[in-house]
């Protein structure tokens, strides 16, 4: 739903009350409140599923809640992606999707969710107590990871419940947008009510809709959200990692995806030319602007049948995800 | 406004093939995928699949993998559907859809109706 | 995949009076915040008219008599007051994967 702020009417100030400055003050507290509470905060959702036909193959679906268009959709296990978590999957909305093993089919299932599927044999086999996270990059929010993993006690063929993260942030590319201007004018808003505090105010007008209303309050994270804001990243270790894939490699350009090859290829490729080229560490997020894409995590070059690439499931597009939905 | 307009009725022999189109305007063709909607007469609704008419990417339902070719004309703005070795059974009438961020379906063509007899 | 039962398959509903039909998945099509599933209406001649997106939120144009709730595997579309122009057949619709299924339709008749 995108939530539209319920500001209440000014009503004219009574004479001497306000000086030359009186409507400029008046009039932008309300406007960045409007800025504000219409800024949706985005969210996202992971599910991770043993399937019961194959009792070591898994099933992860991650899904991006918010009004931005996805740049980037990177899936890792063993924690957070650049936080120890070791990359699975990048899907690109135009330029593809490259997977590593165990990793077996990744695709997008909407133009805002995808899915993995894990194989379930071989040292590289996931097991239940590893920790899968999803990270989608969009603008203007950001980068928002969340992570989830099968409880304990699962049993095959059932699933966590898809829960936004436990570990979610938004990544400096969204601080650095116009999440960053919205945050500095929630800042200004704030410093000019506190400066406002000790002057006569204003008669509101009641609006039908006060500002604390339910309505008025979507544009906050959910309460997990704002919990895992705060939780720093951990690095979680499993014993299902292979410690093969944590190994260093040469650093590349910015500039990897350009060589994935943007042809309809819609069955799985062999090894392209492509595989071998050095994905870069993990580190930064790039603006979109410079064609620049987050990096895909620290990965060596992989040449195995592992690799794969699909060509882009949707065309760059503002999104009309459920907190943008037009 | 998005209109979705479909290509007319269709009379086959079993095991000849048809296709279909769906010129899409009032929208930027290539920013949404295009869906297949199959509904036999008194019946109802089949998803068949979705192109992303940007990259020509497709994702089929299983059972319709083997029966249906989705393809896009970005500079028609027009959506295909092929279907082949006809039988009885694809007898229907058969929608484009333009699907959005969470593949619901705000936008229907008006469908085209699909008749295969000996 | 993803089975959804509409339930009941058809319903005759007096004028000005609730109805409500009923989706059930055979599987969660739910996050903790959101649901992916869909309501359609479908006349005669017709193709389907989106009316509820995510299980709950009315597509614009759409009448506020309609309304749909729901979440996990059990989904509700109710519509209050019914009036002449409602008969129709109504379809529920996922897209929490591929494939994408409908429900087997809900006809209803105004009395």
């Known amino acids: 739903m995108r939530t539209e702020a319920q500001v209440p009417a000014l009503q004219p100030p009574e004479p001497g009350l306000e000086g030359a400055m009186g409507h400029r003050t008046l009039v932008l507290p309300w406007v960045l409140l409007t800025l504000c509470v219409t800024a949706g905060t985005p969210e996202v959702w992971v599910q991770v599923r043993m399937e019961a036909t194959e009792l070591s193959s898994f099933t992860i679906r991650c899904g991006f809640l918010g009004s931005g268009s996805i740049s980037l959709v990177t899936v890792s296990w063993g924690g957070p992606n650049g936080a120890g978590g070791t990359t699975l999957a990048v899907l690109h909305p135009e330029r593809g999707i490259r997977q590593w093993a165990p990793a077996r089919q990744a695709r997008w299932e909407t133009q805002s969710s995808i899915s993995l599927i894990l194989e379930g044999s071989g040292a590289s086999s996931p097991c239940a107590n590893t920790t899968f996270c999803c990270k989608f990059a969009s603008f203007p929010e950001g980068s928002w990871e969340a992570c989830g993993s099968l409880p304990p006690s699962s049993d095959p063929g059932l699933s966590a419940p898809p829960t936004p993260a436990p570990i979610l942030r938004a990544d400096l590319a969204g601080i650095l947008g116009v999440s960053g201007v919205l945050l500095f004018g929630c800042v200004y808003l704030l410093h000019l009510l506190r400066r406002h505090k000790h002057r006569p105010a204003p008669r509101l007008q009641p609006s039908r809709t006060s500002p604390q209303a339910p309505r008025a309050r979507a544009w906050a994270p959910s309460q997990a959200s704002q919990a895992a804001l705060h939780v720093p990243y951990a690095t979680i270790n499993t014993s299902c990692r292979p410690a093969t894939l944590d190994t260093a490699h040469p650093h590349g350009g910015p500039s990897w995806w350009a060589s994935l090859p943007t042809h309809a290829a819609h069955r799985p490729q062999g090894p392209a030319a492509w595989a071998s080229t050095p994905i870069p560490a993990r580190g930064s997020f790039v603006s979109v602007e410079n064609g620049l894409y987050a990096q895909a995590g620290e990965r060596p070059p992989h040449t195995g049948p592992g690799l794969t690439l699909f060509p882009d499931p949707r065309g760059p597009r503002a999104m009309e995800g459920p907190l943008g939905v037009r | 406004q998005v209109q979705l307009q479909q290509s007319g009725a269709e009379l086959a022999k079993p095991g000849a093939s048809v296709k279909m189109s769906c010129k899409a305007s009032?929208?930027?063709?290539?920013?949404?995928?295009m869906h297949w909607v199959k509904q036999r007469p008194g019946q109802g609704l089949e998803w068949i699949g979705y192109?992303?008419?940007?990259?020509?990417?497709?994702e089929y339902n299983q059972k319709f993998k083997d029966k249906a070719t989705l393809t896009a004309d970005k500079s028609s703005s027009t959506a295909y559907m092929q279907l082949r070795s006809l039988t009885s059974e694809d007898s229907a009438v058969y929608y484009c859809a333009r699907g959005s961020s969470g593949s619901w379906f705000a936008y229907w063509g008006q469908g085209t109706l699909v008749t295969v007899s000996a | 995949d993803i089975v959804l039962t509409q339930s009941p398959a058809s319903l005759a509903v007096s004028l000005g009076q609730r109805a409500t039909i009923s989706c059930r998945a055979s599987q969660s099509v739910s996050t903790s915040s959101y649901s992916y599933m869909h309501w359609y209406q479908q006349k005669p001649g017709q193709p389907p008219k989106l009316l509820i997106k995510y299980a709950s939120n009315l597509e614009s144009g759409v009448p506020a008599r309609f309304s749909g709730s729901g979440s996990g595997t059990d989904f509700t579309l109710n519509i209050h007051p019914v009036e002449e122009e409602d008969t129709a057949t109504y379809y529920c619709?996922?897209?929490?994967?591929?494939?994408?299924?409908f429900g087997g339709g809900t006809k209803l008749e105004i009395k």
């Open positions: 192109i992303n008419p940007s990259t020509g990417y497709t």
């Open positions: 009032g929208y930027t063709f290539t920013s949404d995928w």
């Open positions: 619709q996922h897209s929490w994967e591929i494939p994408y299924t």
